[in-house]
């Protein structure tokens, strides 16, 4: 994928609502394009932050302003509905509230669109065809919540454009204005450690590879040509400048780690893997 | 620079028909939701009917629905409204109006008069 | 259906005088209200959007205020363009629903 994106991409934007009791809430919003984060909200202000030099897109400042203007009263009205609903949805303070929605794009083009709210971290009620619908396992509570989300078929409508219109033209627009970052190659670096030894006589090799734009990555240790299937490789991380980092680790009787090596394929190496020889320095191979 | 033109409108007896179009242009047109607007003589703003950026979503105050068709042609950058068994309280300036966002109409054309009468 | 009542029906007023126009929603609609002028034989235009959002392009002697049922616009120096009617919108819940129009003419 030229954007050096996974597909299918998306653009989600996530609200994080926690209720501490009736009075005291808080909430975090961002947007993200698919697992790189491109907006926060800014709820001292009430206005969206833009990390990134291309994260307004192609939409333009009275735009932008719209869709400020749309998430403050949400965000406003969404609190006040939730407080006033709580005690007959059986809302137990604390909770916490997820919402996620946005849209997909799959070969170029838009595929779908999503809007998900969790309570306590599970699945509770989903918006479609302009909508809401209980999620089966959630009960009675779900129905409920749905009865009241549906009362006010305006917001519905706002809703759905944002999915259907709002969301699909503002990623294809991300996308054109992000290009240059996107489609960037950062090649790793990658370095050999000891991990905390595992037991007598063994030994935890560690091969970590950072710094590396995009994020698809392979990482195995090796003896000679031949994967070693022991091999575990962690979470993908991201860091503070917008590349990854991933560690992938082994555990070996001390005197079989001798003939190991750690190689790194990844898109910005040009098929030229580093390879990381246990006993030597590094090479590239 | 928004723009928005409105055509179509005339005296037309009560029963008839009346087609009333509105060219758009100075912004995306297939993005956003379209609404007509009335305004009786002398009197205030009374919202018609609005149609979703896609076409796919249609809505109508109960006043006209069933009589009035709104629709939109988003290759043309046009806007319309198909009105049938006309009365005489349908008398009025007929607006056009883009929405922004589903909050607010935040540019509307110049209006053009349609007269309902015998 | 959302009624608004405006008030009032109409005032007079000077040049530089503060002008303040109430819009009352019989039920509570949050910040989702606007304000228009319209002159003679013209169009409305948007003033204000979401109680309290200038629209671009607008003078910044306008001002919006309240949610929930009462809003006012206020404009803190009235100048001769200004004379005009204004309406209210509601756009909470459908169908969308004016306020029946404030006239401001000179003293």
């Known amino acids: 994928n030229a954007d050096g994106l996974k597909e299918p991409l998306s653009f989600h934007v996530t609200w994080i609502a926690s209720f501490y009791n009736h009075s005291w809430k808080q909430n975090l919003v961002s947007g993200w394009l698919s697992d790189l984060q491109t907006h926060t909200w800014d709820s001292n202000s009430s206005t969206i932050v833009f990390l990134c030099p291309w994260s307004r897109g192609n939409f333009s400042n009275e735009e932008w302003k719209e869709l400020e203007t749309l998430f403050r009263i949400r965000t406003i009205r969404s609190f006040e509905g939730i407080r006033r609903y709580a005690h007959e949805l059986q809302f137990e303070y604390p909770f916490e509230i997820q919402v996620t929605g946005g849209c997909e794009l799959h070969s170029g083009k838009v595929s779908g669109s999503f809007l998900q709210l969790a309570y306590q971290g599970s699945d509770f009620v989903s918006f479609q065809n302009n909508s809401w619908l209980p999620y089966p396992v959630a009960g009675n509570m779900a129905k409920h919540f749905c009865k009241v989300l549906n009362q006010n078929q305006h917001e519905n409508d706002i809703t759905h454009n944002l999915l259907s219109d709002t969301c699909p033209r503002f990623i294809l627009g991300l996308l054109d204005a992000g290009k240059a970052h996107l489609q960037r190659q950062v090649k790793p670096e990658a370095w050999l450690s000891h991990g905390p030894s595992p037991g007598p006589g063994h030994l935890q090799l560690v091969c970590h590879v950072s710094g590396f734009y995009p994020k698809p990555v392979w990482v195995m240790w090796m003896r000679g040509e031949q994967e070693q299937q022991g091999t575990q490789r962690g979470d993908i991380l991201p860091s503070a400048d917008g590349t990854w980092y991933l560690r992938a680790t082994l555990e070996v009787a001390a005197g079989e780690a001798a003939d190991l090596s750690c190689r790194v394929k990844h898109s910005s190496l040009e098929g030229q893997d580093i390879v990381l020889y246990w006993e030597h320095h590094s090479s590239v191979g | 620079e928004v723009q928005l033109v409105e055509s179509g409108g005339g005296l037309v007896q009560p029963g008839g028909s009346l087609r009333l179009s509105c060219a758009a242009s100075?912004?995306?047109?297939?993005?956003?939701?379209m609404s007509w607007v009335r305004q009786a003589p002398g009197k205030g703003l009374e919202w018609v009917s609005a149609?979703?950026?896609?076409?796919?979503?249609?809505y109508y105050a109960d006043s006209v629905k069933g009589r009035f068709t709104i629709s939109r042609d988003n290759s043309k950058n046009t806007l319309y409204l198909q009105m049938n068994s006309l009365r005489a309280e349908d008398t009025a300036v007929y607006y056009c109006?883009?929405?922004?966002?589903?909050?607010?109409?935040?540019?509307w054309g110049q209006g053009t008069l349609v007269t309902v009468s015998s | 259906e959302i009624e608004l009542t405006q008030s009032p029906s109409s005032l007079s007023a000077s040049v530089g005088d503060r002008v303040t126009i109430t819009c009352r929603a019989s039920?509570?609609?949050?910040?989702?209200l606007n304000w228009y002028q319209q002159k003679p034989g013209k169009a409305p235009k948007l003033l204000i959007y979401?109680?309290?959002s200038l629209q671009s392009g607008v003078p910044s002697r306008f001002s919006g205020s309240g949610s929930g049922t009462d809003f006012t616009l206020t404009i803190s120096s009235l100048q001769p363009e200004d004379f005009a009617t204004y309406y209210c919108?509601?756009?909470?819940?459908?169908?969308?629903?004016f306020g029946q129009g404030t006239k401001v003419d000179i003293k």
């Open positions: 109006a883009k929405d922004a966002l589903w909050l607010a109409f935040d540019y």
């Open positions: 919108a509601q756009r909470s819940y459908p169908p969308p629903k």
């Open positions: 149609i979703s950026g896609s076409g796919g979503s249609t």
């Open positions: 039920q509570s609609i949050s910040s989702y």
């Open positions: 979401a109680a309290s």
């Open positions: 100075g912004f995306t047109f297939s993005s956003y939701a």
